[in-house]
Protein backbone atom coordinates (compact mmCIF):
# COMPACT_ATOMS: atom_id res chain seq x y z
CA UNK A 1 0.00 0.00 0.00
CA UNK A 2 1.01 3.77 -0.42
CA UNK A 3 3.17 5.18 2.79
CA UNK A 4 3.69 8.44 3.29
CA UNK A 5 6.72 9.32 4.45
CA UNK A 6 6.81 10.60 8.45
CA UNK A 7 7.60 13.33 9.73
CA UNK A 8 6.92 15.51 12.51
CA UNK A 9 3.91 17.62 10.27
CA UNK A 10 0.38 17.11 11.09
CA UNK A 11 -1.20 14.24 9.98
CA UNK A 12 -4.41 16.07 9.03
CA UNK A 13 -5.15 15.38 4.98
CA UNK A 14 -8.59 17.73 5.66
CA UNK A 15 -9.98 20.06 7.92
CA UNK A 16 -13.28 21.29 9.40
CA UNK A 17 -15.18 23.26 6.82
CA UNK A 18 -17.36 26.33 7.60
CA UNK A 19 -21.30 26.07 8.27
CA UNK A 20 -23.50 28.98 8.04
CA UNK A 21 -27.26 28.79 8.25
CA UNK A 22 -30.43 28.97 10.24
CA UNK A 23 -32.05 27.67 13.44
CA UNK A 24 -32.51 23.63 12.61
CA UNK A 25 -30.33 23.40 10.34
CA UNK A 26 -28.80 20.22 9.56
CA UNK A 27 -25.22 19.99 8.56
CA UNK A 28 -21.42 17.96 8.90
CA UNK A 29 -18.13 18.95 9.62
CA UNK A 30 -15.09 16.13 9.21
CA UNK A 31 -11.53 16.00 9.42
CA UNK A 32 -9.34 13.23 7.57
CA UNK A 33 -6.37 12.32 8.32
CA UNK A 34 -3.49 9.18 7.21
CA UNK A 35 -1.42 7.91 9.81
CA UNK A 36 1.38 5.59 10.10
CA UNK A 37 0.42 2.64 12.46
CA UNK A 38 -2.50 2.21 14.74
CA UNK A 39 -5.31 4.87 14.28
CA UNK A 40 -6.03 7.28 17.35
CA UNK A 41 -9.15 8.42 18.34
CA UNK A 42 -10.43 11.56 17.12
CA UNK A 43 -11.47 14.37 19.44
CA UNK A 44 -13.42 17.34 18.69
CA UNK A 45 -12.94 20.85 19.94
CA UNK A 46 -15.12 23.55 20.00
CA UNK A 47 -13.67 27.03 21.27
CA UNK A 48 -10.68 24.73 22.16
CA UNK A 49 -12.50 22.60 24.73
CA UNK A 50 -13.05 18.77 24.20
CA UNK A 51 -16.72 18.19 22.85
CA UNK A 52 -17.68 14.92 25.55
CA UNK A 53 -20.57 14.21 23.84
CA UNK A 54 -20.20 14.84 20.40
CA UNK A 55 -22.22 12.93 17.47
CA UNK A 56 -19.00 12.01 16.00
CA UNK A 57 -18.27 9.05 14.06
CA UNK A 58 -15.10 7.66 13.12
CA UNK A 59 -14.49 5.89 10.02
CA UNK A 60 -10.63 4.04 9.53
CA UNK A 61 -9.38 1.88 6.83
CA UNK A 62 -6.37 -0.03 7.07
CA UNK A 63 -3.96 0.70 3.30
CA UNK A 64 -2.24 -2.37 3.90
CA UNK A 65 -1.60 -6.26 5.29
CA UNK A 66 0.24 -4.86 7.79
CA UNK A 67 -0.98 -3.17 11.16
CA UNK A 68 2.08 -0.73 10.61
CA UNK A 69 0.94 0.34 7.21
CA UNK A 70 -0.82 3.31 6.95
CA UNK A 71 -4.62 4.50 7.78
CA UNK A 72 -7.21 6.38 6.53
CA UNK A 73 -9.10 7.60 9.08
CA UNK A 74 -12.40 10.31 8.63
CA UNK A 75 -13.93 11.62 11.66
CA UNK A 76 -17.79 13.10 10.76
CA UNK A 77 -19.41 15.61 13.60
CA UNK A 78 -22.99 15.74 12.75
CA UNK A 79 -25.19 18.78 13.64
CA UNK A 80 -28.65 17.66 13.87
CA UNK A 81 -30.26 21.23 14.51
CA UNK A 82 -27.88 23.90 14.73
CA UNK A 83 -28.84 26.36 17.79
CA UNK A 84 -26.92 29.38 18.98
CA UNK A 85 -24.86 27.01 21.85
CA UNK A 86 -23.64 25.40 18.47
CA UNK A 87 -21.95 28.54 17.40
CA UNK A 88 -17.71 28.65 17.28
CA UNK A 89 -14.61 27.44 16.03
CA UNK A 90 -14.28 23.41 15.59
CA UNK A 91 -10.75 21.72 15.78
CA UNK A 92 -10.13 17.84 15.79
CA UNK A 93 -7.39 16.65 17.90
CA UNK A 94 -5.26 13.43 18.00
CA UNK A 95 -2.71 12.34 20.46
CA UNK A 96 -0.22 10.50 18.48
CA UNK A 97 2.92 8.95 20.65
CA UNK A 98 3.93 11.79 22.03
CA UNK A 99 2.44 14.53 20.19
CA UNK A 100 -0.70 15.79 20.07
CA UNK A 101 -1.91 17.51 16.63
CA UNK A 102 -4.98 19.50 16.14
CA UNK A 103 -6.69 20.32 12.44
CA UNK A 104 -7.13 23.93 11.45
CA UNK A 105 -10.49 25.28 12.10
CA UNK A 106 -13.67 25.67 10.57
CA UNK A 107 -16.73 27.62 12.12
CA UNK A 108 -19.97 27.29 12.79
CA UNK A 109 -22.41 30.33 12.69
CA UNK A 110 -25.94 31.62 12.70
CA UNK A 111 -27.38 33.85 9.73
CA UNK A 112 -28.21 36.56 11.24
CA UNK A 113 -25.93 36.95 13.81
CA UNK B 1 -6.28 34.86 -7.57
CA UNK B 2 -4.56 31.53 -7.30
CA UNK B 3 -2.38 30.81 -10.06
CA UNK B 4 -0.10 27.69 -10.98
CA UNK B 5 2.44 28.11 -13.41
CA UNK B 6 3.56 24.70 -14.51
CA UNK B 7 7.15 24.44 -16.93
CA UNK B 8 9.54 21.90 -17.82
CA UNK B 9 8.02 19.80 -20.48
CA UNK B 10 9.67 18.36 -22.97
CA UNK B 11 10.33 15.40 -25.09
CA UNK B 12 12.71 13.00 -23.90
CA UNK B 13 13.72 9.22 -24.62
CA UNK B 14 12.90 6.27 -22.84
CA UNK B 15 15.01 6.44 -19.42
CA UNK B 16 15.99 9.89 -19.56
CA UNK B 17 15.13 12.40 -16.88
CA UNK B 18 12.82 15.30 -16.42
CA UNK B 19 12.47 17.83 -14.07
CA UNK B 20 9.03 19.87 -13.96
CA UNK B 21 8.65 22.66 -11.43
CA UNK B 22 4.91 24.92 -10.86
CA UNK B 23 4.95 28.39 -9.25
CA UNK B 24 2.19 29.15 -7.07
CA UNK B 25 0.88 32.46 -6.27
CA UNK B 26 -2.47 34.09 -4.73
CA UNK B 27 -1.90 31.98 -1.52
CA UNK B 28 0.07 30.87 1.52
CA UNK B 29 1.61 28.03 -0.45
CA UNK B 30 2.89 26.58 2.43
CA UNK B 31 -0.72 26.26 4.27
CA UNK B 32 -1.48 23.71 1.17
CA UNK B 33 -0.81 19.68 0.35
CA UNK B 34 -0.49 20.32 -3.70
CA UNK B 35 -0.34 17.26 -6.42
CA UNK B 36 0.98 16.20 -9.45
CA UNK B 37 -1.82 14.43 -11.85
CA UNK B 38 -1.49 14.28 -15.41
CA UNK B 39 -3.74 13.61 -18.40
CA UNK B 40 -3.34 10.96 -20.98
CA UNK B 41 -4.48 11.36 -24.68
CA UNK B 42 -7.74 9.55 -24.26
CA UNK B 43 -8.49 12.00 -21.68
CA UNK B 44 -8.35 10.20 -18.68
CA UNK B 45 -7.01 11.79 -15.74
CA UNK B 46 -4.41 9.63 -12.81
CA UNK B 47 -2.60 11.20 -9.82
CA UNK B 48 0.93 11.29 -9.78
CA UNK B 49 2.37 12.32 -6.33
CA UNK B 50 1.25 14.68 -3.36
CA UNK B 51 2.96 16.35 -0.35
CA UNK B 52 1.68 18.06 2.52
CA UNK B 53 2.33 21.87 3.20
CA UNK B 54 5.16 21.93 4.98
CA UNK B 55 7.03 18.64 2.95
CA UNK B 56 7.02 16.36 5.46
CA UNK B 57 4.72 13.88 4.26
CA UNK B 58 4.79 12.66 0.46
CA UNK B 59 2.58 9.73 -1.95
CA UNK B 60 3.15 8.22 -4.68
CA UNK B 61 1.29 6.30 -7.20
CA UNK B 62 3.09 2.89 -7.37
CA UNK B 63 4.01 2.67 -10.47
CA UNK B 64 6.21 6.23 -10.62
CA UNK B 65 7.50 5.05 -6.88
CA UNK B 66 11.45 5.17 -7.04
CA UNK B 67 11.50 7.33 -10.33
CA UNK B 68 9.78 10.06 -9.85
CA UNK B 69 10.02 12.52 -6.13
CA UNK B 70 7.43 15.34 -5.79
CA UNK B 71 9.08 17.97 -3.35
CA UNK B 72 8.30 21.52 -2.82
CA UNK B 73 10.51 24.68 -1.72
CA UNK B 74 8.15 26.68 0.35
CA UNK B 75 10.54 29.46 0.33
CA UNK B 76 10.06 29.92 -3.67
CA UNK B 77 6.64 29.04 -3.38
CA UNK B 78 7.56 26.28 -5.90
CA UNK B 79 5.99 22.69 -6.40
CA UNK B 80 8.79 20.41 -8.42
CA UNK B 81 8.22 16.67 -10.03
CA UNK B 82 11.69 15.15 -10.55
CA UNK B 83 10.86 12.53 -13.30
CA UNK B 84 13.57 9.72 -14.09
CA UNK B 85 13.79 6.41 -15.75
CA UNK B 86 11.10 7.68 -17.65
CA UNK B 87 8.74 4.96 -19.77
CA UNK B 88 6.66 6.00 -22.96
CA UNK B 89 3.96 5.20 -21.03
CA UNK B 90 4.57 8.60 -18.79
CA UNK B 91 3.57 10.72 -21.76
CA UNK B 92 0.82 12.89 -20.68
CA UNK B 93 -0.16 16.13 -19.83
CA UNK B 94 1.41 16.85 -16.24
CA UNK B 95 -1.12 19.46 -13.86
CA UNK B 96 0.09 20.62 -11.00
CA UNK B 97 -2.95 21.44 -8.45
CA UNK B 98 -3.68 22.68 -5.11
CA UNK B 99 -5.31 20.70 -2.25
CA UNK B 100 -8.65 21.86 -1.08
CA UNK B 101 -8.23 22.85 3.01
CA UNK B 102 -10.86 20.75 3.70
CA UNK B 103 -9.38 17.59 1.95
CA UNK B 104 -5.72 18.07 0.21
CA UNK B 105 -6.72 14.93 -1.62
CA UNK B 106 -9.40 16.98 -3.92
CA UNK B 107 -7.73 19.66 -5.93
CA UNK B 108 -9.26 23.12 -5.92
CA UNK B 109 -6.99 24.96 -8.24
CA UNK B 110 -4.93 23.35 -11.51
CA UNK B 111 -2.26 25.04 -13.60
CA UNK B 112 -2.38 24.77 -17.17
CA UNK B 113 -0.60 21.58 -17.61
CA UNK B 114 3.09 20.97 -18.73
CA UNK B 115 3.54 18.23 -21.78
CA UNK B 116 5.76 15.55 -21.45
CA UNK B 117 6.53 13.03 -24.37
CA UNK B 118 8.60 10.13 -23.81
CA UNK B 119 9.20 8.64 -27.49
CA UNK B 120 12.31 7.22 -28.87
CA UNK C 1 -7.17 0.44 -5.33
CA UNK C 2 -10.30 2.12 -5.11
CA UNK C 3 -11.83 1.75 -8.78
CA UNK C 4 -14.23 4.85 -9.87
CA UNK C 5 -16.90 4.11 -12.09
CA UNK C 6 -18.72 6.31 -14.64
CA UNK C 7 -21.17 4.02 -16.80
CA UNK C 8 -21.66 6.51 -19.32
CA UNK C 9 -19.16 7.72 -21.60
CA UNK C 10 -21.80 10.11 -22.72
CA UNK C 11 -24.97 11.94 -22.03
CA UNK C 12 -27.02 13.83 -24.35
CA UNK C 13 -29.28 16.75 -23.07
CA UNK C 14 -31.08 20.01 -24.19
CA UNK C 15 -30.82 23.80 -22.80
CA UNK C 16 -32.87 23.37 -19.78
CA UNK C 17 -32.97 20.16 -18.74
CA UNK C 18 -32.11 18.05 -15.70
CA UNK C 19 -29.26 15.75 -16.38
CA UNK C 20 -27.44 13.32 -12.97
CA UNK C 21 -24.14 11.79 -14.03
CA UNK C 22 -23.18 8.80 -11.75
CA UNK C 23 -20.13 7.33 -10.26
CA UNK C 24 -19.45 4.09 -8.31
CA UNK C 25 -16.67 3.23 -6.02
CA UNK C 26 -15.47 -0.20 -5.95
CA UNK C 27 -15.93 0.39 -1.87
CA UNK C 28 -17.36 2.74 0.65
CA UNK C 29 -14.85 5.91 0.15
CA UNK C 30 -17.88 8.08 3.40
CA UNK C 31 -18.48 10.60 0.99
CA UNK C 32 -15.11 11.36 0.17
CA UNK C 33 -15.59 12.50 -3.67
CA UNK C 34 -15.11 15.21 -5.63
CA UNK C 35 -16.33 16.66 -9.23
CA UNK C 36 -14.75 18.20 -11.45
CA UNK C 37 -15.91 19.67 -14.89
CA UNK C 38 -12.92 20.18 -17.79
CA UNK C 39 -14.02 22.11 -21.29
CA UNK C 40 -11.39 21.57 -24.03
CA UNK C 41 -7.94 23.18 -23.66
CA UNK C 42 -9.07 23.88 -20.38
CA UNK C 43 -7.44 22.38 -17.12
CA UNK C 44 -10.38 20.68 -14.52
CA UNK C 45 -12.30 23.03 -12.52
CA UNK C 46 -13.55 21.36 -9.12
CA UNK C 47 -17.23 22.19 -8.47
CA UNK C 48 -17.63 19.79 -5.72
CA UNK C 49 -16.20 17.62 -3.22
CA UNK C 50 -17.43 15.76 -0.07
CA UNK C 51 -19.86 14.33 -1.70
CA UNK C 52 -22.24 17.77 -1.60
CA UNK C 53 -19.98 21.14 -0.77
CA UNK C 54 -20.12 23.21 -3.62
CA UNK C 55 -16.59 24.56 -4.59
CA UNK C 56 -16.61 28.84 -3.71
CA UNK C 57 -18.19 30.55 -7.17
CA UNK C 58 -20.07 27.65 -8.01
CA UNK C 59 -23.49 27.69 -9.35
CA UNK C 60 -26.19 26.16 -7.36
CA UNK C 61 -27.74 24.88 -10.73
CA UNK C 62 -24.89 22.01 -9.50
CA UNK C 63 -25.36 19.70 -6.86
CA UNK C 64 -23.58 16.48 -5.45
CA UNK C 65 -24.92 14.27 -3.51
CA UNK C 66 -24.43 10.31 -2.58
CA UNK C 67 -23.15 8.07 0.28
CA UNK C 68 -21.44 4.61 0.94
CA UNK C 69 -20.31 3.64 -3.04
CA UNK C 70 -22.83 5.73 -5.00
CA UNK C 71 -22.92 8.78 -5.81
CA UNK C 72 -23.99 11.32 -8.37
CA UNK C 73 -23.40 14.97 -9.83
CA UNK C 74 -26.95 17.19 -10.78
CA UNK C 75 -26.92 19.77 -13.38
CA UNK C 76 -30.49 21.67 -13.12
CA UNK C 77 -31.60 23.66 -15.86
CA UNK C 78 -28.53 23.40 -17.53
CA UNK C 79 -26.90 26.10 -20.04
CA UNK C 80 -24.84 25.67 -23.31
CA UNK C 81 -21.54 26.53 -20.75
CA UNK C 82 -22.10 23.60 -18.91
CA UNK C 83 -21.02 21.38 -21.85
CA UNK C 84 -17.80 19.83 -20.96
CA UNK C 85 -16.45 16.86 -19.34
CA UNK C 86 -17.27 15.51 -16.45
CA UNK C 87 -15.20 13.84 -13.67
CA UNK C 88 -15.62 11.98 -10.35
CA UNK C 89 -12.45 11.56 -7.94
CA UNK C 90 -12.21 9.68 -4.58
CA UNK C 91 -10.68 11.78 -2.09
CA UNK C 92 -10.48 9.19 0.57
CA UNK C 93 -6.79 7.68 0.60
CA UNK C 94 -4.33 7.48 -2.09
CA UNK C 95 -3.83 6.32 -4.84
CA UNK C 96 -6.38 8.78 -5.44
CA UNK C 97 -8.53 7.59 -8.73
CA UNK C 98 -10.64 9.44 -11.39
CA UNK C 99 -13.33 8.33 -12.99
CA UNK C 100 -13.22 8.10 -16.86
CA UNK C 101 -15.35 10.54 -17.22
CA UNK C 102 -18.56 11.71 -18.92
CA UNK C 103 -19.10 13.69 -21.77
CA UNK C 104 -22.16 15.94 -21.68
CA UNK C 105 -23.50 16.97 -25.28
CA UNK C 106 -26.40 18.42 -26.60
CA UNK C 107 -29.19 16.78 -28.14
Known amino acids: APRGTQAEESPFVGNPGNITGARGLTGTLRCQLQVQGEPPEVHWLRDGQILELADSTQTQVPLGEDEQDDWIVVSQLRITSLQLSDTGQYQCLVFLGHQTFVSQPGYVGLEGL | EVNLVESGGGVVKPGASLKLSCEAS????????MSWVRQTSDKRLEWVAS????????YYLDNVKGRFIISRENAKNTLYLQMSSLKSEDTALFYC?????????????WGQGSSVTVSS | VIVMTQSHKFMSTSVGDRVSITCKAS??????VAWYQQKPGQSPKLLIY???TRHTGVPDRFTGSGSGTDYSLTISNVQTEDLAFYYC?????????FGAGTKLELK
Open chain 2, 97 to 109: ARGARASYFAMDY
Open chain 2, 26 to 33: GFTFSNYG
Open chain 3, 27 to 32: QDVTTA
Open chain 3, 89 to 97: QQHFTTPLT
Open chain 3, 50 to 52: WAS
Open chain 2, 51 to 58: ISGGGGRT
